[in-house]
Amino acid sequence: EEELQVIQPDKSVSVAAGESAILHCTVTSLIPVGPIQWFRGAGPARELIYNQKEGHFPRVTTVSESTKRENMDFSISISNITPADAGTYYCVKFRKGSPDTEFKSGAGTELSVRAKPS
């Protein structure tokens, strides 16, 4: 069986301030079992944007039904974008465990923020 891939199709996305940004991510397999998390930036200082398993992320909604047992689409929408949201976003698959361990990351999508149209 093919090893799971994390597909972030868009290298970059540009959104006007105040609008919502859709960041696309799909995985190619249901195995291994474990949650998806979204981060802004890479490395130890990366910022958690969304955790499928737990947490409260008021500006983030999932594009499809991520609770569905066989869901492989983990795209998210971030509302009310501001210039402070600019950066590279990574969709990361974790393997279930105690604790969950990082399994594979997507290639990243760079979000740039345009000035609000007057």
């Epitope: 891939q5 597909i7 972030q8 199709p9 868009d10 290298k11 970059s12 696309h24 799909t26 995985v27 190619t28 492989m72 997507g106 290639a107 990243g108 999508t109």
Partner: antibody, heavy 119, light 103 residues
Framework: DVQLVESGGGVVRPGESLRLSCEAS????????MTWVRQAPGEGLEWVST????????YYADSVKGRFTISRDNSKNSLYLQMNSLRADDTAIYYC????????????WGLGTLVTVSS | ALTQPASVSANLGGTVEITCSGG????YGWYQQKSPGSAPVTLI????NRPSNIPSRFSGSTSGSTTTLTITGVQAEDEAVYYC?????????FGAGTTLTVL
């Protein structure tokens, strides 16, 4: 075996309408995004439109936006393309394609149906 | 836009690489069309994945903004037009096509 069979092509005049159909078999149609791709005579492949598995989200190329409408009937395993205000540059073979996990990748294609727009 | 060479040639039994670059895609696919108007066939999707009905002589790889289709042990029946495809709709999805001539 996956099969995609297009129909509905033909010769029409500029400004007229046409509805293409694609009948799918050999896979669980309702689980997959579906796409129309076209190829004008002597030209390369051009993405036209994609529809989500449930049918609630559609994507269009700028060249057809506002004129073409993609739809599907999961109970009939069928995909459609309603083409209005047809122009000469819409003349092409229209292929129906099954999208893989990410919707701009295609794993199976139909044989195509020819649309000719001419006065 | 996705950029690929208009034509390449290869010796029978040899190896050929077709490259494609540019656009706003993180991932790529490859499609073969044996004659104009015939149905395209998917060779590679998501960079490296090959459908089960495609011979193992076709392989794909991606590095940065460039994806490469490699045909190892080129056969006469591989003479065709090869299109790369991107994963982002901003690319228009397809390159202009590369014609492979088998010598």
């Amino acid at each position: 075996d996956v099969q995609l069979v297009e129909s509905g092509g033909g010769v029409v005049r500029p400004g007229e309408s046409l509805r293409l159909s694609c009948e799918a078999s050999g896979f669980t149609f309702r689980n997959y995004y579906m796409t129309w791709v076209r190829q004008a005579p002597g030209e390369g492949l051009e993405w036209v439109s994609t529809i989500s598995d449930t049918g609630d989200t559609a994507y269009y190329a700028d060249s057809v936006k506002g004129r073409f409408t993609i739809s599907r009937d999961n109970s009939k395993n069928s995909l459609y393309l309603q083409m209005n205000s047809l122009r000469a540059d819409d003349t092409a073979i229209y292929y129906c394609a099954k999208s893989w996990i990410w919707w701009t990748f295609f794993d199976y294609w139909g044989l195509g149906t020819l649309v000719t727009v001419s006065s | 836009a996705l950029t690929q060479p208009a034509s390449v040639s290869a010796n029978l039994g040899g190896t050929v690489e077709i490259t494609c670059s540019g656009g706003n895609s993180n991932h790529y696919g490859w499609y073969q069309q044996k004659s104009p108007g015939s149905a395209p066939v998917t060779l590679i999707y998501a960079d490296t994945n090959r459908p089960s009905n495609i011979p193992s002589r076709f392989s794909g790889s991606t590095s940065g903004s460039t994806t490469t289709l490699t045909i190892t042990g080129v056969q006469a029946e591989d003479e065709a037009v090869y299109y790369c495809g991107g994963s982002s709709t901003g690319d228009g999805i397809f390159g202009a096509g590369t014609t492979l001539t088998v010598l």
